[in-house]
C-alpha cells in the first residue's frame, strides 16, 4: 500500500484553496475534540483506475470520490482524512485534505476526488473518508466507509499492469491434454520468450471425492532462444487404478520477475463418462483454468464496461 509519487496530488478547486498532506491517520481533533463538527461525506464511490508512474510503469489505483451534504455544517469543515486499510495485512495509509479557505455554498454540490492510492491485484481494501474535525466521542459519526475489491490478474485491464506483467500475466500457454494408451497423459503447452525452467504438476483424484490419489511433478529445463514460443510436451504415466481418473494439471513457470510466485495455468481432465454405446476416446473437452495467486470473482469496472470474466473454481 503506497502513494503515487507523480503527479503531485491536487485538492484545490474553484472557490477552495486546499493542500494534500501525508497523515498519521490520527487527526488532532481526536485528541482535542471540537464542539462544532461537520456532517459526514455523501455518496462515497471507489472505482478501479490506472495510472502511469514517471518511469512508465502502469499501476492500479483506487479512485475515491465523494460529495458534501448541502447543510450549514460545511461552514465548519476544515478538511478531510482519507484512509485506506488493506484487510489482509491491516496496513493503513492516510492522507489529509487541508482546507486553507472557508467553504461557501455555491450553485453546485461540492465534489472531491483522489486517485493516488496504489493498490495490489486481488486484494480487498476498506476506504474511509472522515470529515475534519472529527466529532466528539459521543457525537454522530462524520465518516463514510466502503469496501473495495481489486480484481486479480485475469481481469483484462489488470493483466497489462506492471505488477501483473511481473508475475507472468501476458503468457498464454494454451495447454492441451490428451490421454494415450497404457495409462498415459500427454500435456503440451507453449513456452514463453524467456530462458526459464518450468514445472508441470499432475494431481489425480477419484470422481467421487476430492482426496488426492496420485501426484507427480516433472521439470522442464530452461528452453534455448530458438525454442521460445514453441510447444513443450510432457508425458505422465498415470495411476493404475481406473477410479483415480480426475486429473488436475498445473504448469508453473519460474520467470525471473516472479521466481516461485509466478501465475500458474491449469487444466482439469474429468473422469470419462462410461456408457454402453460409446467407446472410450482421447479427452478433448478438458476445462481450462487460470490459476491466479488466490481466488477471484467476476468483475465489471468503469474502464472495462460490459465485459465480465468468469473464473472456473474447482
Amino acid at each position: 500500500l503506497r502513494l503515487l509519487d507523480f503527479p503531485a496530488p491536487v485538492c484545490a478547486q474553484e472557490g477552495l484553496s486546499c493542500r494534500v498532506k501525508n497523515s498519521t491517520c490520527l487527526d488532532d481533533s481526536w485528541i482535542h475534540p471540537r464542539n462544532l463538527t461537520p456532517s459526514s461525506p455523501k455518496d462515497l464511490q471507489i472505482q478501479l483506475h490506472f495510472a502511469h508512474t514517471q518511469q512508465g510503469d502502469l499501476f492500479p489505483v483506487a479512485h475515491i470520490e465523494w460529495t458534501l451534504q448541502t447543510d450549514a455544517s460545511i461552514l465548519y469543515l476544515e478538511g478531510a482524512e482519507l484512509s485506506v486499510l488493506q484487510l489482509n495485512t491491516n496496513e493503513r495509509l492516510c492522507v489529509r485534505f487541508e482546507f486553507l479557505s472557508k467553504l461557501r455554498h455555491h450553485h453546485r454540490r461540492w465534489r472531491f476526488t483522489f486517485s493516488h492510492f496504489v493498490v495490489d491485484p486481488d486484494q480487498e481494501y476498506e476506504v474511509t473518508v472522515h470529515h475534519l474535525p472529527k466529532p466528539i466521542p459521543d457525537g454522530d459519526p462524520n465518516h463514510q466507509s466502503k469496501n473495495f475489491l481489486v480484481p486479480d490478474c485475469e481481469h483484462a485491464r489488470m493483466k497489462v499492469t506492471t505488477p501483473c506483467m511481473s508475475s507472468g500475466s501476458l503468457w498464454d500457454p494454451n495447454i492441451t491434454v490428451e490421454t494415450l494408451e497404457a495409462h498415459q497423459l500427454r500435456v503440451s503447452f507453449t513456452l514463453w520468450n524467456e530462458s526459464t525452467p518450468y514445472q508441470v504438476l499432475l494431481e489425480s483424484f477419484s470422481d467421487s471425492e476430492n482426496h488426492s490419489c496420485f501426484d507427480v511433478v516433472k521439470q522442464i529445463f530452461a528452453p534455448r532462444q530458438e525454442e521460445f514460443h514453441q510447444r513443450a510436451n510432457v508425458t505422465f504415466t498415470l495411476s493404475k487404478f481406473h477410479w483415480c481418473c480426475h486429473h488436475h494439471v498445473q504448469v508453473q513457470p519460474f520467470f525471473s520477475s516472479c521466481l516461485n510466485d509466478c501465475l500458474r495455468h491449469a487444466v482439469t481432465v474429468p473422469c470419462p463418462v462410461i456408457s454402453n454405446t460409446t467407446v472410450p476416446k482421447p479427452v478433448a473437452d478438458y476445462i481450462p483454468l487460470w490459476e491466479p495467486r488466490s481466488g477471484s470473482s467476476d468483475y465489471k469496472d468503469d474502464d472495462d464496461k460490459g465485459s465480465s470474466h468468469h473464473h472456473h473454481h474447482h
Epitope: T128, D261, R264, P292, S294
Partner: antibody
Framework: EVQLVESGGGSVQPGGSLRLSCAAS????????MNWVRQAPGKGLEWVSI????????HYADSVKGRFTISRDNAKNSLYLQMNSLRDEDTAVYYC???????????WGQGTTVTVSS | DIQMTQSPSSLSASVGDRVTITCRAS??????LAWYQQKPGKFPELLIY???TLQSGVPSRFSGSGSGTDFTLTISSLQPEDVATYYC?????????FGPGTKVDIK
C-alpha cells in the same frame, strides 16, 4: 498492556443461540480489523470470521455462514459474535484475535468455551 | 477456496536437532503466510509473518522461508520448550485458512 478478553461462552442445546463478546484494551481498537478463531477439542485452529475497522468488510468461514454474525462497537472497544442455530460441531474454544500490521495475528484472547450438546 | 496442507502431521526429535515443517497451499499465495506455535492449553502465538519475517520476541532459532505454494518453518536447534503444535495460515484473501497442524515433541 494490549489485551483481549472473551466472554459469553457456555453450554447450549443444538439449535440454540449464544453471543460472545471480546473486550479490547491497550490499543486503538478502531484502527484494527478483528477476527474470531475457534478450536474444537483436540482439533486444529479454524478461522471463523473477520470484520474491518469500520465494519464495511465482513467475511465468514463457509461452516458458519448464515448462522453467525460478527459485529463491533468501536465506542465500547468491543467485538461480538452472535451465534444462532448452533450445532454439535460448533463446540470449541473461541478466540478473538487482532491482526498484526504486515500479516498474521499477534494478539489473542485467552478464549471462551462454547459447548453445544443435547 | 485454497486448501492448506502441512507435513508431517507429527514428529519426534532430540534436543538440538534441526526440525523442518512444510506447508503447502493448493494455489499460489505469494508470501501471505504466517506460522503459529500453540502449547497445550494455551492460545496460539505468532512466530513468523510474511513467510519469513520473525515476530519480535521470538527466538532466532525459528525461521521461515518460501513463496507461492511451498513454505517451510525451521527450528535450527530444538529446545524442550519448543514442544507444541505448529500451524501455518494463509492470509492473501479471506477465508484465512489454517493448516491442520504439526505436533512436535522430544524423543
Amino acid at each position: 498492556e494490549v489485551q483481549l478478553v472473551e466472554s459469553g461462552g457456555g453450554s447450549v442445546q443444538p439449535g440454540g443461540s449464544l453471543r460472545l463478546s471480546c473486550a479490547a484494551s491497550g490499543f486503538t481498537f478502531s484502527s484494527y480489523s478483528m477476527n474470531w478463531v475457534r478450536q474444537a477439542p483436540g482439533k486444529g485452529l479454524e478461522w471463523v470470521s473477520i470484520i474491518s475497522s469500520r465494519s464495511s468488510i465482513i467475511h465468514y468461514a463457509d461452516s458458519v455462514k448464515g448462522r453467525f454474525t460478527i459485529s463491533r462497537d468501536n465506542a465500547k472497544n468491543s467485538l461480538y459474535l452472535q451465534m444462532n442455530s448452533l450445532r454439535d460441531e460448533d463446540t470449541a474454544v473461541y478466540y478473538c484475535a487482532r491482526p498484526k500490521v504486515g500479516g498474521g495475528m499477534d494478539v489473542w484472547g485467552q478464549g471462551t468455551t462454547v459447548t453445544v450438546s443435547s | 477456496d485454497i486448501q492448506m496442507t502441512q507435513s508431517p502431521s507429527s514428529l519426534s526429535a532430540s534436543v538440538g536437532d534441526r526440525v523442518t515443517i512444510t506447508c503447502r497451499a493448493s494455489q499460489g499465495i505469494s508470501n501471505y503466510l504466517a506460522w503459529y506455535q500453540q502449547k497445550p492449553g494455551k492460545f496460539p502465538e505468532l512466530l513468523i509473518y510474511a513467510a519469513s519475517t520473525l515476530q519480535s520476541g521470538v527466538p532466532s532459532r525459528f525461521s521461515g522461508s518460501g513463496s507461492g505454494t511451498d513454505f517451510t518453518l525451521t527450528i535450527s536447534s530444538l529446545q524442550p520448550e519448543d514442544v507444541a503444535t505448529y500451524y501455518c495460515q494463509k492470509y492473501n484473501r479471506a477465508p484465512f485458512t489454517f493448516g491442520p497442524g504439526t505436533k512436535v515433541d522430544i524423543k
